[in-house]
Every structure is written in structure tokens, then in C-alpha cells.
Interface confidence: medium
């Protein structure tokens, strides 16, 4: 249905509050360096304009596309050239090229300092003084740090954030109430950001087909009672929603997401028995609840896969006349029967099945050729199972910090050219897989671990793409989305790497280290570990363990000393010399 005014249509559909929030998020994701006040002003002006168009659809400029209206607004920002350099050149272009240009300038690593919460009393005062501004600042700070954050989900988290303050600002001990709740929300927000970045990368780098395949597998696991037609319908709609959000079309994205939630709730009977509770909630909570809903039980009478995909004499006809539909059915049937498999594994199996049919359907006797195809899946299934088992055993032995360090060593040896901050960030996140997944029952471990690893490795790929330094990282990132993790797992030590020159400055520490929170202290130590490996890539695990032990003791000793700075400047060089000698 065509609307006279697109902006009025979205304003009416979303309501003023959500509309304003989404516009603020959109601008903050495009112009990440602009101060909050500027974005509030822009969002207010756009919302006022939308309101006027809703009242009179044939008003001046109301018929313009959202990209045109938003782009024109962004291009009025006076400091565009100073703050963003060549991004200002986007403003010379016409739509749709101008929007594509803005998207290309989104910075996945803007380098803003981590958000540090002020004192609880100050926070509560700000919250009570102007709730709308307080939540707007939250949207802005998250959006500018995460330019691909899933906007409707960010509105949901802002609502959660509001709930935390509404509750905790009434509490006797505000700090004790706020601390754990804000931290739990922070973890969820970071994971949500990484998951959406993975979805956007799937769409942008590998296309709709890859994203749809991923979604078919995931939703078939979650809704095994739904038939393929129903799964396909939801996947098609979901693809549109994520394409819009990844493309910066946040108003359309949020509106379509609400429509999808409405459709799912109206068709619960043919999707899942688990949707009822979600469907009684208001729109933001409803969509979030549906996205996180627990898996439905498997239907009890599922026939053998072999009947349809191996034993049937028409397999090649079915495949050749409608390849994607046939493979989609295979993926659906396999996924609904295997909720314990990771999505990545299911996609590898579908790929293997496709390759087998491509080969066999060209032979004189296809049925004999593909007769054992399902048995050939075994090594593909065994590989992630063994990987999870081995790594969870290591995690249980070393704990999270020790496991992160083991991964740090592993990944620095695989790709020593990658920047130290990136190696530290990614290895720390990879290490969290242990905490997140290893305590789960066997039936959930692989799915939890491998799909989480895919999301974290995507972060490595995104950061590496900005400044490519390692051909092997580029290769693993770009060749196949579903084989990224096995590709990284399979990388051996990079023997071509020329060790980095020793730089004493890298290993110089100061008393400020002592007052850092534990997590930041760990980052400092892990940074030193990576630098050490870049200097001495042939160091053995034993040697590294000794040096890191000495380093830990040195930090502990100096932080307990009367004259901390003096201790660091005197003992530091001795430690470095001892480390160099130990690593010869």
C-alpha cells in the first residue's frame, strides 16, 4: 500500500515516543561523534515535522522519502567536515547513493571510553529530574558505540533501564540495588549488539540467502511443530526486518517487526505452543519475548529423514527443479529433529548434502551415489562436539581468566599481525564462552558454544576488515560464513611472522594499575602477554606461564608497597630483563 507521506505513516504506526527514540538512535548511529544535545535537537525537529505531516499529509516536503528527509537533516550539521572529514562528501551525492555513503562511514570501533556510571545519587537525581532526557542519553550512548544495534531492541532495553531506575532510586541502598541490575543489563546489551552485527554481516557480506538459511535452521529448531510454509513466511518477514535495520531504515524496521509479532501471535496455533505468554504483552516486550521464546516440544511422529532425502527415487528431480526450496526443506527437517546442534553445524550439513546432490545427480546412478549421504555427516558432527568437550575441560581446569589467556596465546600465534587491543578483546570474549556454555547440559552445549563463537569471530572479522593485516584472517572471514569457526580453529602457528622489535615502553607499568577494577587489570596483563608473544612467538606454554606468574607477583608486590610508583620503576625493568632471559 502506497502512502502519500511515508514519514506520517511511520509516525502514526509507531506513536510519538517510539518514533522520536528511533530517530535519535538513527542519527546517533550515523553521526557517532556529535554531542548528545545536537542529536536531541535533530530528533525533536524531525519528530515535529512528522507530527505536522500526520496532521496534513499533503504539507510541504511530507511526500519525500525517509532517506531524503534524514539525509537532508544530517547534512545541515555544521561541524560535519571538521568532525567526520570525508563523510561530508556524502552530502554531495543524491539518494540512494548518499545513504549508502553514510552507511559506509559507520565506525564499528569508534574508540569512545567505556561508559562509567556516576554516583547513584547523581544518577537518580538526573533520572527523576528529566526521565525522557535521561533515557534519551542512554539510547544515544549505546547507539553511537554500536552503530548496528538492533534499534527496536534498544528501545526495549531503554525501557528495562527505566524500570531499574524506577525501582532502585526508591531503595534504601541505591548502589547495592543498581550495581548488579545495571551490570546484568550491560551484559545483555553487549551480546545483543554482537548478535545483530553478525546478522548484518551475514546480509551485507553473504546476502539474503545466507541469512535466510541461518534463520530457517534457527526457527525450525525453535518451532518444530510449525510446517515449512509457516517457517518460510516468518523467515521472509524477519529477513526484511533485519535488512531494514542493518540498512539504517529504523522506522520501517521497527514497524515491520511489530507487524511480524502481530502475525505470529495471530497464528500461534500453526507456529508454537509457547507463544501465548508473549502475546499478552505490549509491543516492545512482545517482540522481545518472541525473539527469546523457549523451544517447543518436537512432534512425536516425525518420519525418518532418509525416506524423503535419500530413499526416494525423485530426489534429483526435486533438487534440480527447485534447488533452494528442496534444500530449505532438508534444512528445516534436519534442524527440527536436532535442537542440540548449532545452527552453523546444520548449515554445514545442508551444504554437504547440496554438494553430494550436485555430484551425484550428474552420474548414471544417482541413488547409489547418494545412498550413504547421511552417514557422511558423522565427521562434521564429531568435530564441533570434540572441540566443545576439549575446550570445556580446559575451561573447568583453568577458570575464565586462565582460559582467556590460553585463547590469547592460541590466537596471537595464529594471527600475530592483528592489533593487540583486538586480540585481547576477541580472546576475552571467546573465553566467556566457557562461563556461558560449559555449565549447560550436554544437549545444549554445542549449540550455545558454536553459535556464540560465530558471533565473537564476526567481531574479529569486522574489526580486521577496517584495517586488514593478516591474509589468513581475511581468508577465514570471507570464504564461507558457516565455516568461519572451523577455519579459525584449523589455523596453525603463523610461521611467516617476523617477530616484533622489543620496546621497553610496552612493558612499563605505573602505580595507576593498582586502582583499576579487576577486569581492567586483567586487560593490562593480557595486553602484556600478547606483546610478549609478538616479540617471542616461539615461547612455549611453560615459559609463558612462568613469565605471567612472575608478572602477577610483581604487580601484587608493587601494589602492596609503600612507594608504589618507586617499586614499579625499580622492579619493572628487572622483571622485563628476567622475562627476556627466560624466553631465549
Amino acid at each position: 500500500e502506497a502512502y502519500k507521506s511515508e514519514i506520517a505513516h511511520r509516525y502514526n504506526d509507531l506513536g510519538e515516543e517510539h518514533f522520536r527514540g528511533l530517530v535519535l538512535v538513527a542519527f546517533s548511529q550515523y553521526l557517532q561523534q556529535c554531542p548528545f544535545e545536537d542529536h536531541v535537537k535533530l530528533a525533536k525537529e524531525v519528530t515535529e515535522f512528522a507530527k505536522a505531516c500526520a496532521a496534513e499529509e499533503s504539507g510541504a516536503n511530507c511526500d519525500k522519502s525517509l532517506h531524503t528527509l534524514f539525509g537532508d537533516k544530517l547534512c545541515t550539521v555544521a561541524s560535519l567536515r571538521d568532525k567526520y572529514g570525508d563523510m561530508a562528501d556524502c552530502c554531495e551525492k543524491q539518494e540512494p547513493d548518499r545513504n549508502e555513503c553514510f552507511l559506509a562511514h559507520k565506525d564499528d570501533n569508534p574508540g569512545f571510553p567505556p561508559l562509567v556510571a556516576p554516583e547513584p545519587d547523581a544518577l537518580c537525581a538526573a533520572f527523576q529530574d528529566n526521565e525522557q532526557l535521561f533515557l534519551g542519553k542512554y539510547l544515544y550512548e549505546i547507539a553511537r558505540r554500536h552503530p548496528y544495534f538492533y534499534a527496536p531492541e534498544l528501545l526495549y532495553y531503554a525501557q528495562q533501564y527505566k524500570g531499574v531506575f524506577a525501582e532502585c532510586c526508591q531503595a534504601a541502598d541505591k548502589a547495592a540495588c543498581l550495581g548488579p541490575k545495571i551490570e546484568a543489563l550491560r551484559e545483555k546489551v553487549l551480546l545483543s549488539s554482537a548478535k545483530e552485527r553478525f546478522k548484518c554481516a551475514s546480509l551485507q557480506k553473504f546476502g539474503d540467502r545466507a541469512f535466510k538459511a541461518w534463520s530457517v535452521a534457527r526457527l525450525s529448531q525453535r518451532f518444530p511443530k510449525a510446517d515449512f510454509a509457516e517457517i518460510s513466511k516468518v523467515v521472509t518477514d524477519l529477513t526484511k526486518v533485519h535488512k531494514e535495520c542493518c540498512h539504517g531504515d529504523l522506522l520501517e524496521c521497527a514497524d515491520d517487526r511489530a507487524d511480524l509479532a502481530k502475525y505470529m501471535c495471530e497464528n500461534q496455533d500453526s507456529i508454537s505452543t509457547k507463544l501465548k505468554e508473549c502475546c499478552d504483552k505490549p509491543v516492545l516486550e512482545k517482540s522481545q519475548c518472541l525473539a527469546e521464546v523457549e523451544r517447543d516440544e518436537l512432534p512425536g511422529d516425525l518420519p525418518s529423514l532418509a525416506a524423503d532425502f535419500v530413499e526416494d527415487k525423485e530426489v534429483c528431480k526435486n533438487y534440480q527443479e527447485a534447488k533452494d526450496v528442496f534444500l530449505g526443506t532438508f534444512l528445516y527437517e534436519y534442524a527440527r529433529r536436532h535442537p542440540e546442534y548449532s545452527v552453523s553445524l546444520l548449515l554445514r550439513l545442508a551444504k554437504e548434502y547440496e554438494a553430494t546432490l550436485e555430484k551425484c545427480c550428474a552420474t548414471d546412478d544417482p541413488p547409489t551415489c547418494y545412498a550413504k549421504v547421511l552417514d557422511e555427516f558423522k565427521p562434521l558432527v564429531d568435530e564441533p562436539q570434540n572441540l566443545v568437550k576439549t575446550n570445556c575441560e580446559l575451561f573447568e581446569k583453568l577458570g575464565e581468566y586462565g582460559f582467556q589467556n590460553a585463547l590469547l596465546v592460541r590466537y596471537t600465534k595464529k594471527a600475530p599481525q592483528v592489533s593487540t587491543p583486538t586480540l585481547v578483546e576477541v580472546s576475552r570474549k571467546l573465553g566467556k564462552v566457557g562461563t556461558k556454555c560449559c555449565k549447560k547440559p550436554e544437549s545444549e552445549r554445542m549449540s550455545c558454544a558454536e553459535d556464540f563463537l560465530s558471533v565473537v569471530l564476526n567481531r574479529l572479522c569486522v574489526l580486521h576488515e577496517k584495517t586488514p593485516v593478516s591474509e589468513r584472517v581475511t581468508k577465514c572471514c570471507s570464504e564461507s560464513l558457516v565455516n568461519r569457526r572451523p577455519c579459525f580453529s584449523g589455523l596453525e602457528v603463523d610461521e611467516t611472522y617476523v617477530p616484533k622489535e622489543f620496546n621497553a615502553e610496552t612493558f612499563t607499568f605505573h602505580a595507576d594499575l593498582c586502582t583499576l577494577p579487576e577486569a581492567e587489570k586483567q586487560v593490562k596483563k593480557q595486553t602484556a602477554l600478547v606483546e610478549l608473544l609478538k616479540h617471542k612467538p616461539k615461547a612455549t606454554d611453560e615459559q609463558l606461564k612462568t613469565v605471567m606468574g612472575d608478572f602477577g607477583a610483581f604487580v601484587e608486590k608493587c601494589c602492596a608497597a609503600e612507594n608504589k610508583e618507586g617499586c614499579f620503576s625499580e622492579e619493572g625493568p628487572k622483571l622485563v630483563a628476567a622475562a627476556q632471559a627466560a624466553l631465549v
Partner: nanobody
């Protein structure tokens, strides 16, 4: 729940024609694999013709190829079987079956079709 209702059967002379219909409710007929089977007295249910959902891939048993045509009208949510050059050995009760969730016919095995109509009798005799 899917309901299927066949009609169009009857008595016809050898060489004659009939058109069977199968009206579906509870699921769109273009979203699911549908097929015609037949069962002669004292015999098992035998595949006659099928059509894939979403993609119009058609399938025929060797014994009916060139004589029977399967088709569907999505707007009426109805499946058809046009039967020409009928022979006495075509005498049977004709059933339509569907497999929701399967966009393609991937089987000629009756057991794999969970939903059936009640059947319509076709008698070919002079």
C-alpha cells in the same frame, strides 16, 4: 487441521474423460505438497500424480503419463485431476493426500501423507 474433500467421480466408458476435484480447507493448497492416490479393491493405495507446493513440479505414475494431468487453482484452494483416455484398469477409489510442511512432493509412499480425503469412486466400464 487440514480437511480435504474429493468430488467428480462416477461411471464412465473406456476412452472417456473425468475431472476430479479436491477442495482443501485449513491450509493453502499452494503451500503444501498434494497428490492423488488410488486404491482398487483388495489392493494397496497407489500413487497416481503429485504437485509440489510453491513450485509447480508435477509427478506422474508411469501408468498414467500422457493421459492424466494434475493442476490446482490457488484462488479456489482446490486440486484437480483431469483424466483422459480412461481404461478399465483405472477403476478405483481416488483419494487426495497432503503433506503440510513439505513444499515438494518427495515421496510416492502413501504412509508419508498425514491428511486424506474420504475418496471418490471412479468406475471405467462399458
Amino acid at each position: 487441521e487440514v480437511q480435504l474433500l474429493e468430488s467428480g467421480g462416477g461411471l464412465v466408458q473406456p476412452g472417456g474423460s473425468l475431472r476430479l476435484s479436491c477442495a482443501a480447507s485449513g491450509r493453502y493448497i499452494d503451500e503444501t505438497a498434494v497428490a492423488w492416490f488410488r486404491q482398487a479393491p483388495g489392493k494397496g493405495r497407489e500413487f497416481v500424480a503429485g504437485i509440489g507446493g510453491g513450485v509447480d513440479i508435477t509427478y506422474y505414475a508411469d501408468s498414467v503419463k500422457g493421459r492424466f494431468t494434475i493442476s490446482r487453482d490457488n484462488s479456489k484452494n482446490t486440486l484437480y485431476l483431469q483424466m483422459n483416455s480412461l481404461r478399465p484398469e483405472d477403476t478405483a477409489v481416488y483419494y487426495c493426500g497432503t503433506r503440510p510442511g513439505r513444499p515438494l512432493i518427495t515421496s510416492k509412499v502413501a504412509d508419508l501423507y498425514p491428511y486424506w480425503g474420504q475418496g471418490t469412486l471412479v468406475t471405467v466400464s462399458s
